[in-house]
């Protein structure tokens, strides 16, 4: 169980002296910060009693484990039911208490009802202040029982709930008809999940045999222990004012734990700590009682004295809960009450005894909670005890429970059970989470959910190149911090597994899903420089570059141009994919433009240093394209040209270009200049024979325009094969603009 | 769903007797308080007789006392009232009701009659 | 024992009145009244309980109110289906009723 406890500080006579506090003995516990352990809550339940409201309670945390609630400011602020909830996960539990009015109608005799599943359960309310009304039963808030106030029994109203299963748990009331509630008589039923003695799923365990009032847990079999009560039976009694699993915590004040209720886990509920008993716990036990409640009774034989907070003092020569055994009858000793083990490992599991005779190695033996027994290997003798020593099999996870200790000789028997714990070592249920990756190295989040049990002692970080069959490398960390993974190799995928360990021998967990996590490329260091750029037309520009000679491959996938229009600030980015293009035509520009042009090489994602920029100017955009664009064969070497002038002109028209290629013909076009803008007609010399031409033209005014329609035509035949196409006579002294 | 079904009215002569059922469903009978309440014909409605739910306590108008027995079979989910030296005055449509009470434990408790039968009509007359 | 008076006897309204219904009660009952609906040949509804709490399933244009003596039950815009008798009934001591209340079409 959880070691959890809620104090209760019932020294009523002025309520903003009351207090609550939790304490939690767990590891971690109310830290909050760390991912493997949440915080301590401490709070009041307004569900079921509702309060009018008043100032808001004080939660001050004090320390890690410790949490107090005050500020109560009058007495019906008490009233009702508080809440502390510690333990992480699974173990995550919720300790109740509740606060009963002094000042009440109705008072229960018992607070806290912890009974069986079948169980006949009787809730029992003393009247207090007597009323002539019915008297209402209620169950967590609702409507439940009624009684005629004539049915009272020696001053008592008693609910009766026969055969109690686990859902009649809850919080009961009995209220007069027509008074506050607040004057309410309030219960607490804990009905455990099994028959009295029985634990597990469907039951089939059997408990420890709790001692001193200690209540077995319907889940784990564990003895939830009073206040001031030990070990795995509870056998053992703590130091007056102590309490705690463990002992460890100390009741507050010089009266020690007097006037403090101590709530524990379910199904152990409430009661005042060992010594204590009362309404407000502030009653030492009667001479022969001792205990939690002072609900146990010494019945100490052989001269034992009775002590409220432990129980029978021995005289020397005898032990035993009423001192009914002789020491020369064998004991087992110094036996832990818990031990813990991981699943499939080979303990060894000691074992000493004393007595009179000599225990030997075949009086001890060790059996298991399927009844079976070992034999110890070895006995190491010494002159106070013998120590026997067991080789555990191989642990499965049905060997979790009771184990007992048993020692036999002439003179008696001694038994001592203890707990065994097969925990499961944890397995990841997801793969590590990439945070951020370089060229070299990957950073890596190691912190996931598993299966099995913690805590996680240390988490190992596997990893090789995928598809390798090279062997994994490890490194260790801290479970709470990212990991960086150095040295890598650029451009890699690597598998990464997570590997959890908890404490122990054979903690280690088993591997858990690989991840795929990639390296980033090395960054390009070349740096381009631009050769040159030629205008090709208003929109169109042809730009060129070198990259610096280095030995070895080149390190990059492509290039990035980028032209900046500073004027509209927009940029343009154009991607050139192959490493080894040293050119490229930028098209779709806009005309007219002042541009900066740099170049910069690209590996993966990276971009190199870029080249030193370039600025480049545009010509503006030329007119609209020349209509009705008509082509006709004069000769066999002739093609007249007739078209008309484009319209809505921007300017003057400085010239027109004419483009002449051969249908079907592989090679460059011919661009020739008409220099006379007026024309509207001229003649194309110098054309082959028999040859099916294409024409189109554009006119210039600061720049080019668009081109007209392509119109097609074909010289007659017969003619000689001429040297080439010209315009009119002056074709040769202007030669040809390609 | 709550259900309360009367049975067991009819004609009968003056200084007769008559027993009334009321079988109840859909909750915790046992854990009840019930109730008769009649309705003289055009007139008011008239507590008759409670019994708490152990069957240990009853309570009757005086109009009624010494005549009329009220009683339950938590086992049978059943109310009954015996009607013993019937008069003309008794002649009504007899009710059984549960007694409800207000929920949360915030809340004052006070008691009502939260569902009724349809009712059976008893007709005393010679 | 506790006597319930109610006022008035009867009385005629029509559909989308304000209606108010009043209850005395002989001695001090703190909260603890109810109100009842019920229609001719029909078993009675609870309503209200104590003094102003609505039930579920209850029209919010019915409300109650008073506390002591001296009690009201009031329908803020009477409906088609609200004809009918209404009675109020102490819880406070041995359960009585009023004598009812009829509201009849107008």
């Known amino acids: 169980a959880v070691d959890l406890t809620l104090l209760a500080n019932l020294r009523l006579t002025d309520p903003q002296r009351f207090f609550l506090t939790c304490v939690s003995g767990e590891a971690g516990a109310g830290r909050g910060s760390d991912a493997w352990g949440p915080p301590l809550l401490l709070e009041k339940d307004d569900r079921i009693v509702r309060t009018p409201p008043g100032p808001p309670l004080r939660l001050a945390r004090n320390g890690s484990h410790q949490v107090t609630l005050r500020g109560f400011s009058k007495p019906s602020d008490l009233v009702g039911v508080f809440s502390c909830v510690g333990g992480a996960g699974a173990r995550r539990t919720r300790v109740i208490y509740v606060h009963n009015s002094p000042g009440a109608h109705l008072l229960p005799d018992k607070v806290t009802h912890t009974v069986n599943k079948g169980d006949t359960a009787v809730l029992s309310a003393r009247v207090h202040k007597e009323k002539q009304t019915d008297v209402i039963w209620k169950s967590n808030g609702s409507y439940f029982y009624t009684l005629d106030w004539h049915e009272a029994q020696d001053g008592r109203f008693l609910l009766q709930l026969p055969n109690v299963q686990p859902p009649s748990s809850g919080i009961y009331s009995a209220t007069y008809l027509e008074a506050s509630p607040l004057g309410s008589a309030f219960f607490r039923l804990i009905v455990r999940g099994c028959g009295a003695g029985r634990w597990g799923p469907g039951c089939t365990k059997e408990c420890p045999g709790c001692l001193h009032g200690g209540v077995c847990h319907d889940h784990d079999g564990e003895c939830v222990c009073p206040p001031g009560f030990t070990g795995t039976r509870c056998e053992q009694a703590c130091r007056e004012g102590r309490f705690g699993q463990s002992c460890q915590e100390q009741c507050p004040g010089i009266s020690g734990c007097r006037g403090l209720t101590f709530c524990l886990p379910d199904p152990y509920g409430c009661s005042c700590g060992s010594g204590w008993r009362g309404s407000q716990c502030q009653e030492a036990c009667a001479p022969g009682h001792f205990g939690a409640d002072c609900r146990l009774q010494c019945q100490c034989q052989n001269g034992g004295t009775c002590d409220r907070f432990s129980g029978c003092v021995c005289p020397s020569g005898w032990h035993g809960v009423h001192c009914e055994k002789s020491d020369r009858i064998p004991q087992i000793l110094n036996m832990a009450s818990e031990l813990e083990f991981n699943l499939e490992t080979m303990p060894r599991i000691n074992c000493a005894a004393a007595g009179n005779p000599f225990p030997v190695r075949g009086s001890i033996e060790l059996r298991k909670p399927d009844g079976t027994v070992l034999l110890s290997t070895k006995a190491i003798v010494e002159p106070e005890k013998t120590t026997a020593e067991f080789e555990v099999p191989r642990l499965v996870l049905a060997d979790s429970g009771f184990w007992e200790c048993r020692v036999s000789t002439s003179g008696g028997q001694d038994s001592r059970r203890f707990k065994v714990n097969v925990k499961v070592p944890p397995v990841p249920l997801a793969a590590p989470r990439l945070l951020t990756k370089q060229s070299r190295q990957l950073v890596v989040s190691p912190l996931v959910s598993f299966s099995g049990d913690g805590p996680i002692s240390t988490v190992r970080l596997h990893y090789r190149p995928q598809d390798s069959t090279m062997d994994w490398s490890t490194i260790v960390v801290d479970p709470s911090e990212n990991v960086t993974l150095m040295n890598l190799r650029p451009k890699t995928g690597y598998s990464v597994r997570v590997q959890l360990s908890r404490p122990g021998e054979g903690g280690e967990g088993a591997w858990g899903p690989p991840t795929l996590m990639t390296t980033d490329c090395p960054e390009p260091l070349l740096q381009p420089w631009l050769e040159g750029w030629h205008v090709e037309g208003t929109d169109r520009l042809r730009v060129s570059w070198s990259l610096p000679l280095v030995p070895g491959p080149l390190v990059g996938d492509g290039f990035l141009l980028r032209l900046w229009d500073g004027t509209r600030g927009q940029e343009r980015r154009e991607n050139v994919s192959s490493p080894q293009a040293r050119t490229a035509l930028l098209t779709g520009l806009t005309p007219g433009t002042h541009y900066q042009l740099d170049v910069q090489l690209y590996h993966c994602t990276l971009l190199g240093p870029a080249s030193p920029p370039a600025h480049v100017l545009l010509p503006p955009s030329g007119p609209p394209a020349p209509r009705h664009l008509h082509a006709q064969a004069l000769s066999d070497s002739e093609i007249q040209l007739t078209w008309k002038h484009p319209e809505a002109l921007p300017g003057p028209i400085s010239k027109y270009v004419v483009e002449v290629q051969v249908a079907g013909g592989a090679g460059d076009p011919l661009w020739i200049d008409v220099d006379r803008p007026e024309e509207t007609s001229t003649i194309i010399r110098g054309l082959n024979a028999s040859t099916r031409y294409l024409f189109r033209m554009r006119a210039s005014i600061q720049g080019l325009g668009d081109w007209s329609n392509t119109v097609e035509e074909s010289t007659l035949g017969n003619g000689l094969q001429a040297e080439g196409p010209v315009q009119e006579s002056r074709a040769a002294e202007e030669g040809l603009d390609q | 769903e709550v259900q309360l079904l009367e049975s067991g009215g009819g004609l009968v002569q003056p200084g007769g007797s008559l027993r009334l059922s009321c079988a109840a469903s859909g909750f915790t009978f046992s854990h009840y308080q019930m109730l008769w309440v009649r309705q003289a014909p055009g007139k008011g409605l008239e507590w008759v007789s409670s019994?708490?739910?152990?069957?240990?306590?009853?309570y009757y108008a005086d109009s009624v006392k010494g005549r009329f027995t009220i009683s339950r079979d938590n086992s049978k989910n059943t109310l009954y009232l015996q009607m013993n030296s019937l008069r003309a005055e008794d002649t009504a449509v007899y009710y059984c009701?549960?007694?409800?009470?207000?929920?949360?434990?915030?809340?004052?408790?006070?008691?009502?009659?939260?569902?009724w039968g349809q009712g059976t009509l008893v007709t005393v007359s010679s | 024992d506790i006597q319930m008076t109610q006022s008035p006897s009867s009385l005629s309204a029509s559909v989308g009145d304000r209606v108010t219904i009043t209850c005395r009660a002989s001695q001090t009952i703190s909260s603890y009244l109810n109100w009842y609906q019920q229609k001719p040949g029909k078993a009675p509804k609870l309503l209200i309980s104590?003094?102003?709490t609505l039930q579920s399933g209850v029209p919010s244009r019915f409300s109650g109110s008073g506390s002591g003596t001296d009690f009201t039950l009031t329908i803020s815009s009477l409906q088609p289906e609200d004809f009918a008798t209404y009675y109020c009934q102490q819880s406070y001591s041995t359960p009585s009723f009023g004598q009812g209340t009829k509201v009849e079409i107008k």
């Open positions: 019994i708490y739910p152990s069957g240990g306590w009853t």
């Open positions: 009701a549960r007694v409800g009470y207000s929920s949360g434990w915030y809340a004052l408790t006070s008691k009502t009659f939260d569902y």
């Open positions: 104590a003094a102003s």
